[in-house]
Amino acid sequence: LSVQQGPNLLQVRQGSQATLVCQVDQATAWERLRVKWTKDGAILCQPYITNGSLSLGVCGPQGRLSWQAPSHLTLQLDPVSLNHSGAYVCWAAVEIPELEEAEGNITRLFVDPDDPTQNRNRIASFPG
């Protein structure tokens, strides 16, 4: 089982939409796939896919999940808020027929405030 996640870095404006994609591949077929999205180490959702369908369509605040065969799991955040900034990781595990698991690399999401004044203040507050 292999998991590829993208993009590595995503910068969006507050109130817009952010799309994170996880590509899950396995050489052999699977009956049930458990998937998980985490943000800064905390679980946002942990549904499974079986018979081509997700057991859950919601993932965290304003998060929507979709599965597109053969291999694409998409997390769409809409509308994006400042609280969505963070490090996202996609994890997958084949539960049936045999346990296999893998995780993607981090996607870092940066949300810029809608107010340019806030944006200047935020950038100015970085150390160094």
Partner: antibody, heavy 120, light 113 residues
């Protein structure tokens, strides 16, 4: 260009262990998402999957051979190996190494094959 | 284990004529999760190792002549050659990768009449 090359003795005595090595060039066997495989073909017959080892080190064997098979990897030499114990004349075959990717599921690159004869 | 049954075992063909090889699996190779058939076709020319022709039942590998085509779904698959050429001689094998152990058909030997 990815190339695989089998090596090992062409003659093995009955009850002994058959040992073959596959050297991979043009590609690192530590690359994630790949299965390093062994397949054999009895003279004039079809193909039989022996087993493979995944990038993670996890092995998968054909149940018909599982009790006698060991597949391992030597990352420092970019090689993987097959050991088949307690051989009989029925193990006489051309042995191929090949690779398979999670993203495909087919055997993309094959070695040229090496004939191993089991005879005293 | 999934049993792959290939027919015919031998196929004499006149150059320029079409050829068809059947492969039946003992269980479905279609996944509702990935919407794929886990079925590949290989050609093994005399004295060579097998080479992939078709994957996922119907997708032709880049570089494979378009006279080769694969079709079918579930348990019933076909490899067709629209116009056989002399260089097409060899043994054709179907292979399933739906589950381990991976299994192959017994092969079809295509020969020129």
């Amino acid at each position: 260009q990815v190339q695989l090359q089998e090596s090992g003795p062409g003659l093995v005595k009955p009850s002994q262990t058959l040992s073959l090595t596959c050297t991979v060039s043009g590609f690192s066997i530590t690359t994630g998402g790949y299965y390093w495989s062994w397949i054999r073909q009895h003279p004039g017959k079809g193909l039989e999957w022996i087993g493979y080892i995944y990038t993670s080190g996890r092995t998968y064997y054909n149940p018909s051979l599982k009790s006698r098979v060991t597949i391992s990897v030597d990352t420092s030499k970019n090689q993987f190996s097959l050991k088949l114990s307690s051989v009989t004349a029925a193990d006489t075959a051309v042995y191929y190494c090949a690779d398979m990717a999670d993203k495909g599921g087919w055997f993309a690159y094959w070695g040229q094959g090496t004939l191993v004869t089991v005879s005293s | 284990d999934i049993v792959m049954t290939q027919t015919p075992s031998s196929l004499p063909v006149t150059p320029g004529e079409p050829a068809s090889i059947s492969c039946l699996s003992s269980q479905s190779l279609f996944s509702s999760n990935t919407k794929r058939n886990y079925l590949n076709w290989y050609l093994q020319k005399p004295g060579q190792s097998p080479k992939l022709l078709i994957y996922h039942a119907s997708t032709r590998l880049s570089g494979v002549p378009d006279r080769f085509s694969g079709s079918g779904s579930g348990t019933d698959f076909t490899l067709k050659i629209s116009r056989v050429e002399a260089e097409d001689v060899g043994d054709y094998f179907c292979q399933q990768h739906y589950e381990t152990p991976l299994t192959f058909g017994d092969g079809t030997r295509l020969e020129i009449k």
